[in-house]
């Protein structure tokens, strides 16, 4: 249950997380199993261990085996493994079943292919992209922060794709490359208009100054998977990331859920310790697709200060 | 807005079984970090730690009890249950459950309470 | 078990001074650089709310007036100036070791 098999290739980056979660205020050590060594926190050596993360910068076909990782909690220690296998790099195009992650279906509406394990990775934009070997090139191929958009998606474009990037720790930079298969599937679906289902047109929030408060922007777009739809929030018009206020974050990410049928998206906006100032904002939910966009838009009220324990 | 309640019966015989639920809102039990334990506090006395369930399912109890003790959770109910074998009058106590969050681990929010008086 | 014991039992503040309870554990509740020990406030009828958490965090919610302090085996809950509805058992708790243990309490009253 605890154990995860990680792989990668010769002279190229390699990192893996802890199969046990914590906190982080819990300190992780990590050893080679076989001798129980405890594997360096320092930097400086190829292979080390930061937090939840073993980094193999890079990995050497030497370093295949098993890790333990343990999370260690004051009362309690969690104790994981990782098997890490790494692998020669072959000569001609073929890359081998062992070296492929999962394999994603895709359909006319829905394109995606996400880059496998990227987010444990220090990289930069834009990612590069491979299918059977070949650099792809069209106006169809877009690489988008962590995934590729194909647009009009056939049956040929089903296939291997090997996404590539640079890992930058401390002003070195390593190159990655994972490849997962794309298979293109019939879907019968349809897209509507934006329906918002939270919040309500002219909500009013109440909340408590000091405290974390949650608004949850949540809307459906059809049925079946979509393509180009998005949930999110601007605080009076203007984009969270540009509005410049560190205390109020969206949740990165959006997730997707099918209720009866229908895709829906929600967006989380975190606020952090409310401010009377935050009352005077105005809050726009905005749901939008290839049929247009919706707002609806929320203030927030001062909530009279109740014992939040009961 | 995180809110935790308390339910079981109100009075137990003594050598029977206690079962309290504690029905949570506000946060997942599945999240990594989280955890739920029960604290109970006889009439006027001190508070004393019974047992928590962590969000991988790892439990812990209170060595003096634990033979006496088991911790469950359903996530999906956002429930977690604690037993209780043969009851004393001397376990008469107001049984709180709370949630432990934050970086650390600590009680951050507790539930009102539901008072257990065991007699015959 | 690490035992906590708070002193004193009782005492009795008037409005606008200082009021300090010390908590001292059997042995350290350190982890990591860090005190694992809390504060909690419980009134009559109702369950503990935390006041401080890790020693000296004062928690959200919870006004300036109450403050934490402390390290290793002694710990002090201050509360400056006390209110009238301050009226309450305050208790320490450590979560360094299991069990988690909670000291016996100390009862504000205010002249």
């Known amino acids: 249950k605890f154990s995860k098999q990680s792989w990668g290739l010769e002279n190229e980056a390699l990192i893996v997380r802890c199969p046990r979660q914590g906190k982080p205020s819990y300190t992780v050590d990590w050893y080679y199993s076989q001798t129980n060594k405890s594997i360096p926190t320092q930097e400086r050596n190829r292979v080390f261990a930061s937090g939840q993360l073993l980094k193999f910068l890079p990995a050497a076909v030497a370093d295949s085996g098993i890790y333990t990782c343990i999370v260690r909690s004051p009362t309690f220690n969690r104790t994981g493994y990782a098997n890490v296998t790494i692998y020669k790099k072959q000569s001609d195009c073929n890359v081998p079943d062992y070296l492929m992650y999962s394999t994603v279906s895709g359909s006319e509406k829905n394109s995606k292919i996400y880059c496998p394990t990227i987010d444990l990775y220090n990289w930069t934009a834009p990612l590069e992209w491979f299918k059977n070997c070949q650099a792809l090139q069209g106006s169809r191929y877009r690489a988008h922060k962590s995934f590729l958009v194909i647009d009009n998606v056939m049956t040929e474009d089903a296939g291997d794709y090997t996404c590539k990037f640079i890992h930058n720790e401390n002003g070195a930079n390593y190159s990655v490359t994972a490849t997962r298969s794309f298979t293109v599937k019939d879907e019968q679906g349809f897209s509507l208009f934006p329906v918002i289902g939270a919040p309500a047109q002219n909500e009013i929030k109440e909340v408590e100054i000091g405290k974390n408060a949650n608004l949850t922007c949540s809307a459906c777009f059809g049925k079946g998977t979509q393509f180009l739809a998005a949930v999110l929030w601007q605080l009076n018009g203007t984009k969270i990331t540009d509005f410049g206020e560190p205390r109020i974050q969206q949740e990165e990410g959006q997730n997707q859920s099918f209720s009866n049928g229908l895709a829906c998206l929600d967006m989380v906006l975190r606020i952090a310790d409310v401010k009377e100032e935050d009352l005077l904002l105005q809050y726009d939910c905005l749901a939008l697709n290839l049929h247009g966009l919706r707002r609806h838009t929320v203030r927030l009220s001062r909530k009279n200060p109740i014992d939040h324990h009961s | 807005q995180v809110t935790l309640k308390e339910s079981g019966p109100t009075l137990v015989k003594p050598t029977q079984t206690l079962t309290l639920t504690c029905t949570f809102s506000g946060f997942s039990l599945s999240t990594s970090g989280m955890g739920v334990g029960w604290i109970r506090q006889p009439p006027g006395k001190a508070l004393e730690w019974l047992a928590h369930i962590w969000w991988d399912d790892v439990k812990q109890y209170n060595p003096a009890l634990k033979s006496r003790l088991t911790i469950t959770k359903d996530t999906s109910k956002s429930q977690v249950v604690l037993t209780m074998t043969n009851m004393d009058p001397v376990d008469t106590a107001t049984y709180y459950c709370?949630?432990?969050?934050?970086?650390?681990?600590?009680?951050?929010?507790w539930g009102q309470g539901t008072t257990v008086t065991v007699s015959s | 078990d690490i035992v906590l014991t708070q002193s004193p039992a009782s005492l009795a503040v008037s409005p606008g001074q200082r009021a300090t309870i010390t908590c001292r554990a059997s042995e350290s509740v350190e982890y990591s650089g860090t005190s694992l020990m809390q504060w909690y406030q419980q009134k009559p009828g109702q369950p503990p709310k935390l006041l401080i958490y890790v020693a000296s965090n004062v928690e959200s919610g919870v006004p300036a007036r109450f403050s934490g302090s402390g390290s290793g085996t002694d710990f002090t809950l201050t509360i400056n100036p006390v209110e009238a509805n301050d009226i309450a058992n305050y208790f320490c708790?450590?979560?360094?070791?299991?069990?988690?243990?909670f000291g016996q309490g100390t009862k504000l009253e205010i002249k």
């Open positions: 709370a949630r432990i969050g934050g970086d650390y681990d600590y009680f951050d929010f």
């Open positions: 708790q450590q979560s360094r070791k299991v069990p988690w243990t």
